[in-house]
């Protein structure tokens, strides 16, 4: 399927609108600091060039690879060295090393200002004045802040963003119509970004085999009626799509994702009975819908797994003939029977099974050796079940904010070297598992909770990788993808940690806290809590809770005061002195 001109091929497949949007996303994900106008100019230049190649595929440079064309274009940016420092050195390299170099410089936590939402009327005016620029700006701002955002899915978000403004800017109460929609898009967008980040980390840090194993387990749960060969085909195609997107090949990725959606819909009879509604939707909605589709019902009367994977005399023969295929079949069979297990648990079981076969198939009596392999699964299954039960009980007792605080204390004591903003962000997200998953019945709790925790802990891992400060975090992040959560759960208080020196500035607050949203105010309090634990890691839960209540009383008092700033200055000093006296800070 070789094309004379790759850029012409993708332009024709995707259409001009999607082509331009995807090139903008690609450029913004690579050059995260560049102004919007510069990116638009580069995109227009690439688009004009693509059109010349569509007209004549033999035209000059049309035969070049997309990486070459895009890389050359990025390297024309005049301020590359001043803005990006050593990333400019990438431009001295040849493809494919140049693209790899750009990928390595993607920043998960770019130093960009927080996106502040303007007044609704201001946004509606901007939308009406220039809809195209308004929507491009959305793509640009999201892409540069989330350099691994799944590009074809971002097109779907942009479509919903446009629909929200189209509808709400005509409504009687624009704000009541628009703001909840924007909140929903923001929250879904953050979740989508984090989920995709885990897929890319899985591919980049643990390799294609790890990603394929994840995909076999997840797709087998989702499509339990599909044959193993069908699931394997879907896994191969899905792996290609995500490898491309994670590698910055966004045009190929979007094109292949569309092909995969088409294939799934054409073959839904042999895949799942739940796809009908998805397959009636337009392309972007269809792909999104398929990715989120509920698990199909399990086929009735599935035989016991033991027959093929424990009792059969051919276990070692089948394993030796094609190890990964046999393990893939095991994973497929186990996963389709267990929609109640998390994907990471299924992968742990498969790993245990693999380890047992590796050992036993070399033993004198292999069958005797592996006969009890399923017994080894019991503690692996019970560990997340118990953990989820305990934490859901705690969540129900405390509510989300105080559950987050409990996790903040727990994780700060485990890894106190990690930066305070990272601990706050990660612990707040870990705490959201309660509202997200504890409402589910037992059969849905584990896949909801543990797979969500994998996504959140990956955020910790990628943020920590940028500036590593804790050997314990590095160890849990790098040793095993599927055991990250158990590794973090098993960490106790870091006894080697030398408490942070007390700094009064850290605990100085101002009247601006009074005008913050409830969420922002919570973050301020949680930041103080992390700092408190870093200063006093031996403080008991009760002491920390009491000091935080003093802090709440202080904020409440000063926010009611006539002279708020004076109150914060004077009472703040008293609060610090009182806490120092009580905790011996």
């Amino acid at each position: 399927d070789a094309h004379k001109s790759e850029v012409a091929h993708r332009f024709k497949d995707l259409g001009e609108e999607n082509f331009k949007a995807l090139v903008l996303i690609a450029f913004a994900q690579y050059l995260q600091q560049c102004p919007f106008e510069d990116h638009v100019k580069l995109v227009n230049e690439v688009t004009e060039f693509a059109k010349t190649c569509v007209a004549d595929e033999s035209a000059e440079n049309c035969d070049k690879s997309l990486h070459t064309l895009f890389g050359d274009k990025l390297c024309t940016v005049a301020t590359l060295r001043e803005t990006y420092g050593e990333m400019a050195d990438c431009c001295a390299k040849q493809e494919p090393e140049r693209n790899e170099c750009f990928l390595q410089h993607k920043d998960d936590n770019p130093n960009l200002p927080r996106l502040v939402r303007p007044e609704v009327d201001v946004m509606c005016t901007a939308f009406h004045d220039n809809e195209e620029t308004f929507l491009k700006k959305y793509l640009y701002e999201i892409a540069r802040r989330h350099p691994y955002f799944y590009a074809p899915e971002l097109l779907f978000f942009a479509k919903r963003y446009k629909a929200a403004f189209t509808e709400c800017c005509q409504a009687a109460d624009k704000a009541a119509c628009l703001l909840p929609k924007l909140d929903e898009l923001r929250d879904e967008g953050k979740a989508s970004s984090a989920k995709q980040r885990l897929k890319c980390a899985s591919l980049q840090k643990f390799g294609e085999r790890a990603f394929k194993a994840w995909a076999v387990a997840r797709l087998s749960q989702r499509f339990p009626k599909a044959e193993f060969a069908e699931v394997s085909k879907l896994v191969t195609d899905l792996t290609k799509v995500h490898t491309e997107c994670c590698h910055g090949d966004l045009l190929e990725c979007a094109d292949d994702r569309a092909d995969l959606a088409k294939y799934i819909c054409e073959n839904q009879d042999s895949i799942s009975s739940k796809l009908k509604e998805c397959c009636e939707k337009p392309l972007l909605e269809k792909s999104h819908c398929i990715a989120e589709v509920e698990n199909d019902e399990m086929p009735a009367d599935l035989p016991s797994l033991a027959a093929d994977f424990v009792e059969s005399k051919d276990v070692c023969k089948n394993y030796a003939e094609a190890k990964d295929v046999f393990l893939g079949m095991f994973l497929y069979e186990y996963a389709r029977r267990h929609p109640d297990y998390s994907v990471v648990l299924l992968l742990r079981l498969a790993k245990t099974y693999e380890t047992t076969l590796e050992k036993c198939c070399a033993a004198a009596d292999p069958h005797e050796c592996y006969a009890k392999v399923f017994d080894e699964f019991k503690p692996l299954v019970e560990e997340p079940q118990n953990l989820i039960k305990q934490n859901c009980e705690l969540f129900e007792q405390l509510g989300e904010y105080k559950f987050q605080n409990a996790l903040l204390v727990r994780y700060t004591k485990k890894v106190p070297q990690v930066s305070t903003p990272t601990l706050v962000e990660v612990s707040r997200n870990l705490g959201k598992v309660g509202s997200k998953c504890c409402k589910h019945p037992e059969a849905k709790r584990m896949p909801c909770a543990e797979d969500y925790l994998s996504v959140v802990l990956n955020q910790l891992c990628v943020l920590h990788e940028k500036t590593p400060v804790s050997d314990r975090v590095t160890k849990c992040c790098t040793e095993s993808l599927v055991n990250r959560r158990p590794c973090f759960s098993a960490l106790e208080v870091d006894e080697t940690y030398v408490p942070k020196e007390f700094n009064a500035e850290t605990f100085t607050f101002h009247a601006d806290i009074c005008t913050l949203s409830e969420k922002e105010r919570q973050i301020k309090k949680q930041t103080a809590l992390v700092e408190l634990v870093k200063h006093k890691p031996k403080a008991t839960k009760e002491q920390l809770k009491a000091v935080m209540d003093d802090f709440a009383a202080f904020v409440e008092k000063c926010c009611k005061a006539d002279d708020k700033e004076t109150c914060f200055a004077e009472e703040g000093k008293k609060l610090v002195a009182a806490s120092q006296a009580a905790l011996g800070l």
Partner: nanobody
Framework: QVQLVESGGGLVQAGDSLRLSCAAS????????MGWFRQAPGKEREFVAR????????YYADSVKGRFTGSRDNAKNTVYLQMNSLKPEDTAVYYC?????????????????WGQGTQVTVSS
């Protein structure tokens, strides 16, 4: 469950002093802030003072600031309210309360356990 018992109320002249005590038993005492509230006939229960968990930080209602002092002795599970320069408008039933896990520090709804109250009457 916590039992709180106030004592020390009585009838005094304007300008006099009284010291209220509140003895706690049951649930952990030292981990929670304690509050003093009062309720005059026909009025809402109002905040008077909050004494933090360690006794190192005290907040007062503007109407009593400079005249009343809250303190606590965690070894004795007791909280105190020293009331000086009493005025007739200080007449009320005084309650001590233990802080709950949520809600405002300056509102009765933010406190979980309550004593039965002690009457303070200030005559002119």
């Amino acid at each position: 469950q916590v039992q709180l018992v106030e004592s020390g109320g009585g009838l005094v002249q304007a300008g006099d002093s009284l010291r209220l005590s509140c003895a706690a038993s049951g649930r952990t005492f030292s981990g929670y802030a304690m509050g003093w509230f009062r309720q005059a006939p026909g009025k809402e229960r109002e905040f008077v003072a909050r004494i933090n968990w360690s006794g190192t930080l005290t907040y007062y209602a503007d109407s009593v600031k400079g005249r009343f002092t809250g303190s606590r002795d965690n070894a004795k599970n007791t909280v105190y309210l020293q009331m000086n320069s009493l005025k007739p408008e200080d007449t009320a039933v005084y309650y001590c309360a233990q802080r709950g896990d949520s809600g405002s520090n300056y509102d009765p709804s933010g406190y979980r356990y309550w004593g039965q109250g002690t009457q303070v009457t200030v005559s002119s």
